[in-house]
Each structure stands twice: as structure tokens, then as C-alpha cells.
Interface confidence: low
């Protein structure tokens, strides 16, 4: 009779993480008598996966009934596969011996490859806000995928970004891999509503990439522009001065009125109006009693936005002229820019 052969018909088996792997093995003869064992790896360091004779292997089930006398099918199923299960599995026939069974013949081995989906990409931005025209960095991370081949792309509002660096770790063989990418994004004044997207494509996703997003509203700070104007006289000896605070983000803003350097009133932006680009406008006004002043009055609108150093704009109120003669075109001493936006 021909000598027993151990046949593992599958050179390789590909299984998705979480699924069950079937490792096939048949013997060509019932003799010699003795058990079958399954190992992962070869040599002295091999790992026992299943022993027909003894032991507890909760994740392993046999395909056929190994207790039947004429059974020659020693295939097994391994449940709930993880990337850590990847490797080459050997079906090994032992010959009954005393005191120990003796290894008789091994199958050629079946390589188990595990495909695992990448985790949802997590995008994180800088810890502190930055103003337009600054370059900020975003990171994207995804973990636990296998095989190693993966593609990552960055987009800002649907437009692909090119300034990024990506690493897949580890460099060598591993049961699973991680990807880390850092992209540089230049902020513009219109970025309050913008999104940065990290897209990851992998064999397990089949053209339906995973996306992670970050809203630039959490990253950007748009500083306000100030404009102080004197309104027409409301009543005898009273002048209304307004401070227009325009195009700022986020909303956190405190405004202080100074009359000749002395604090007159402080308020916090509350009823703001929102622009199409997501920035805010706000207006504060100060009623000045001209008769209480003998000399010209220097009015200053001072704004502290989002915890940043205060910016201010001043306006000289001429007391010498009769209030009724004062129009809104009174010469103003301005510090900083004076954008005039029409709303």
C-alpha cells in the first residue's frame, strides 16, 4: 500500500477579519494510526493550533467527525479571525507511539492572509487658532488594516491637496498596519465654512473610501476690521458715535469705549449678524453729551477678539463747533485699516 500523504490543497487562503477561516487537510490513508495536529509556523517555535487527541481549542472546529474510524478529512475552521492569525498553517500527521506520538508527515502548508479594513480616519488640526494666510497642519490617522497597500488623499472643499507627507507603519511584515499623514493647509478669510477631508482607499473598501473630516471653523480666527463713524445729531448737545466691527470669527469679542483714554463702557458682542462666509458683524454705539466737554473729545473703540491683543480705532469729536453743524464727515484720526464694506 502507498505511504500516507498529507494533502493541504490550498496554498493560500484569504479571509476577512471577523470571519471564519477554513483550512483544508486530507490524508490518503488510514495508516499509520495516530492523531493529527495543526500548527502555525514550522520548526521548534511553531504554535499548536489544534490537537485531535487532547486540549481545549475554543476557536477551532473540525469540518468532519474525527471520531469516525474511516475519517481521512482533518480540515479545521478557525472562527473570529484577526490580523494576528495570519501565517502558514501546517497539518501534521503523528504516528501512535509510546510514551509519545511521533511526527510522521506534514502537509505543505496553507498561508492564511487576513484582510482587515482600516479604521475610520481621524483628522485632527492645530491646538491653537490661526489667522488667514497662515499655514496650518492637519494629521490623519487610520489603523488596523491589512494588507499594507493603501492610498490616502487630502482635500479642502473637494479640491485635492498636494502638500502632505504620509507614512505607513511598520515598514516590515506585520499582522496589521497604520497610516499617518500630515497635510499643510493655507488659510483664507473665506475658510470659516471650509472642510479638510482625509480619504483612505484600501482593497477591503472596494472603491468606497473612508473619510475623516475637520472643520476649519475650529482652526481659523478672522480678526475684525473696525470703523468708527459719527452719526447726525440725535438731540441738542448729543452726538451718536458708532463702531462697526466687521468680518470676525469666532464670535467671542469684547468692546470697550474710551473717552479721552478713560473707560466709558464695556460690552460683549451678543446680537451679531452672520455673513455668507460665516464671519460675523456687530455694531456698538455711544451717545456723547457734548455739553459735558469743554475741549475736543477723542473717542476710541477698542476691541479684544478671541483673547487676542486689543485693536482700536479712534475718532476726534470737535466740541468747538456747534453740534448741529457737525455732519458725519468729521475728520477722524484712524489707527489701523479702515475698510468700508457695504451691507
Amino acid at each position: 500500500e502507498e505511504e500516507l500523504q498529507v494533502i493541504q490543497p490550498d496554498k493560500s487562503v484569504l479571509v476577512a477579519a471577523g470571519e471564519t477561516a477554513t483550512l483544508r487537510c486530507t490524508a490518503t490513508s488510514l495508516i499509520p494510526v495516530g492523531p493529527i495536529q495543526w500548527f502555525r509556523g514550522a520548526g521548534p517555535g511553531r504554535e499548536l493550533i489544534y490537537n485531535q487527541k487532547e486540549g481545549h481549542f475554543p476557536r477551532v472546529t473540525t469540518v468532519s467527525d474525527l471520531t469516525k474510524r474511516n475519517n481521512m478529512d482533518f480540515s479545521i475552521r478557525i472562527g473570529n479571525i484577526t490580523p494576528a492569525d495570519a501565517g502558514t498553517y501546517y497539518c501534521v500527521k503523528f504516528r501512535k507511539g509510546s510514551p509519545d506520538d511521533v511526527e510522521f508527515k506534514s502537509g505543505a502548508g496553507t498561508e492564511l492572509s487576513v484582510r482587515a479594513k482600516p479604521s475610520a480616519p481621524v483628522v485632527s488640526g492645530p491646538a491653537a487658532r490661526a489667522t488667514p494666510q497662515h499655514t496650518v497642519s492637519f494629521t490623519c490617522e487610520s489603523h488596523g488594516f491589512s494588507p499594507r497597500d493603501i492610498t490616502l488623499k487630502w482635500f479642502k472643499n473637494g479640491n485635492e491637496l498636494s502638500d502632505f507627507q504620509t507614512n505607513v507603519d511598520p515598514v516590515g511584515e506585520s499582522v496589521s498596519y497604520s497610516i499617518h499623514s500630515t497635510a499643510k493647509v493655507v488659510l483664507t478669510r473665506e475658510d470659516v465654512h471650509s472642510q479638510v477631508i482625509c480619504e483612505v482607499a484600501h482593497v477591503t473598501l472596494q472603491g468606497d473610501p473612508l473619510r475623516g473630516t475637520a472643520n476649519l471653523s475650529e482652526t481659523i480666527r478672522v480678526p475684525p476690521t473696525l470703523e468708527v463713524t459719527q452719526q447726525p445729531v440725535r438731540a441738542e448737545n448729543q452726538v451718536n458715535v458708532t463702531c462697526q466691527v466687521r468680518k470676525f470669527y469666532p464670535q467671542r469679542l469684547q468692546l470697550t469705549w474710551l473717552e479721552n483714554g478713560n473707560v466709558s463702557r464695556t460690552e460683549t458682542a451678543s446680537t451679531v449678524t452672520e455673513n455668507k462666509d460665516g464671519t460675523y458683524n456687530w455694531m456698538s454705539w455711544l451717545l456723547v453729551n457734548v455739553s459735558a466737554h469743554r475741549d475736543d473729545v477723542k473717542l476710541t473703540c477698542q476691541v479684544e477678539h478671541d483673547g487676542q491683543p486689543a485693536v482700536s480705532k479712534s475718532h476726534d469729536l470737535k466740541v468747538s463747533a456747534h453740534p448741529k453743524e457737525q455732519g458725519s464727515n468729521t475728520a477722524a484720526e484712524n489707527t489701523g485699516s479702515n475698510e468700508r464694506n457695504i451691507y
Partner: antibody, heavy 123, light 107 residues
Framework: QIQLVQSGSELKKPGASVKVSCRAG????????MNWVRQAPGQGLEWMGF????????TYAQGFKGRFVFSLDTSVSTAYLQIGSLKAEDTAVYYC????????????????WGQGTLVTVSS | DIQMTQSPSSLSASVGDRVTITCRAS??????LAWYQQKPGKAPKSLIY???YRYIGVPSRFSGSGSGTDFTLTISSLQPEDFATYYC?????????FGQGTKLEIK
């Protein structure tokens, strides 16, 4: 070389069902999604949906939910389209088409097409 | 659903002519646009993906351009084997949708 080979023409009566096969050759079926496209006589192309050949999960376009079933038999590298309760308006050529690739973001462009299967529904 | 409108629906041209077919999307599809060629009784053949990239084996006389909503397929010098129906397809958003086709006939 890469080929998608579809089953032959079918003549069916209304109310019957039909199963069209699409055998993938020259590549591993489970590496690329498989789409199904319908072309009624003298008409244009209409996307029916696709099946993720790795997970077996189907996605159906709006007009193809219910009577249409996408399935796989990976052991024979074959994708299937089954149509139940056939109607005269199901008469068309049905194509399988492979999604271009998974290492880029052009998941919905088709690089290879089957030769088509004509399904005729007539009493 | 995104509507894809091709123009013209049909056109007659001669061998050696330069021909342009346009495709307009009802919404922005970025560059997620493909072109296919179909001859009577045959399966479609893939020509262009990502609006501008030719598949391997597609002659260089075929070129694609455009992004967003407006796209064109240009055949620089018509050959006898180019007379067929051409379809554009967007794959930016499910459901994937095709144009109604442009039939290119011999003049």
C-alpha cells in the same frame, strides 16, 4: 488576460425568473467591485447597482430594488444577477462591468465589461 | 440624481475630421467622469476615466478634458473604426448616471 464572460441569451415568459452569470477571469474576483448595467433595445446605458465582491454586500439603484438580486459564488469566480417576476419591460441586454480599481478613488469608472446577456421576456 | 446631458445627440463626420462631443452634468462632479464607446451589438468599451486619463490601449487620438460640470471628448482625426455611440458617465455620486449617448455616423 482579464475577461468577464457572461451566460448566453435567455427567452423567458412573464412572471418567470432568470439568473445571468458573469465569470471573472485573469484576476481575483474579490479584489474589484462588480457593477450591473442594463440597456433596453435602442436605448442608452442604465446603472443598476453593484456588489462589493469582498463582503458580498449589494447596492441597488432606486429602480432596481425588490425583483433584482446580485450575488456571488467566489469558488467559481462568478457574479450573478437574478431577476424575478419578469415583465416585458425587463427585455434588455444586461452587462456586468468591473470597477476600475481600489488603489485610487475612481471606484465608479468601469474598466472591463462582459459581452452582455440578452434577456427577452415574451409570452 | 445627477443628470448627464450630451450634445449633440448625433453627428455626421468624415474620416480625418476632428470631432468634439460635450457632456454637461447637472451638478458638480469634480473629475469623476468616464467616457465609453459602443458599437452596435457589442459591449461598451472603456476609453477615458477621471475626465482626462486614457485606458491602456486606447489610441492617443482620443482625449478628454473638463472638470466640474462641463466635459468634452475629442477625437483628433477620425478613423473608420471610431464610428460608434459614445457615452459619458459620472461616478461622483450614487446612483452612477450615464449621458443619453452621442451617435457618430459617417458623412
Amino acid at each position: 488576460q482579464i475577461q468577464l464572460v457572461q451566460s448566453g441569451s435567455e427567452l423567458k415568459k412573464p412572471g418567470a425568473s432568470v439568473k445571468v452569470s458573469c465569470r471573472a477571469g485573469g484576476y481575483t474576483l474579490t479584489d474589484y467591485a462588480m457593477n450591473w448595467v442594463r440597456q433596453a433595445p435602442g436605448q442608452g446605458l442604465e446603472w443598476m447597482g453593484f456588489i462589493n465582491t469582498y463582503t458580498g454586500e449589494p447596492t441597488y439603484a432606486q429602480g432596481f430594488k425588490g425583483r433584482f438580486v446580485f450575488s456571488l459564488d467566489t469558488s467559481v469566480s462568478t457574479a450573478y444577477l437574478q431577476i424575478g417576476s419578469l415583465k416585458a419591460e425587463d427585455t434588455a441586454v444586461y452587462y456586468c462591468a468591473r470597477t476600475r480599481g481600489y488603489y485610487d478613488f475612481d471606484g465608479g469608472a468601469f474598466d472591463y465589461w462582459g459581452q452582455g446577456t440578452l434577456v427577452t421576456v415574451s409570452s | 440624481d445627477i443628470q448627464m446631458t450630451q450634445s449633440p445627440s448625433s453627428l455626421s463626420a468624415s474620416v480625418g475630421d476632428r470631432v468634439t462631443i460635450t457632456c454637461r452634468a447637472s451638478q458638480n462632479v469634480g473629475t469623476h467622469l468616464a467616457w465609453y464607446q459602443q458599437k452596435p451589438g457589442k459591449a461598451p468599451k472603456s476609453l477615458i476615466y477621471s475626465a482626462i486619463y486614457r485606458y491602456i490601449g486606447v489610441p492617443s487620438r482620443f482625449s478628454g478634458s473638463g472638470s466640474g460640470t462641463d466635459f468634452t471628448l475629442t477625437i483628433s482625426s477620425l478613423q473608420p473604426e471610431d464610428f460608434a455611440t459614445y457615452y459619458c458617465q459620472q461616478y461622483n455620486t450614487y446612483p452612477l448616471t450615464f449621458g443619453q449617448g452621442t451617435k457618430l455616423e459617417i458623412k
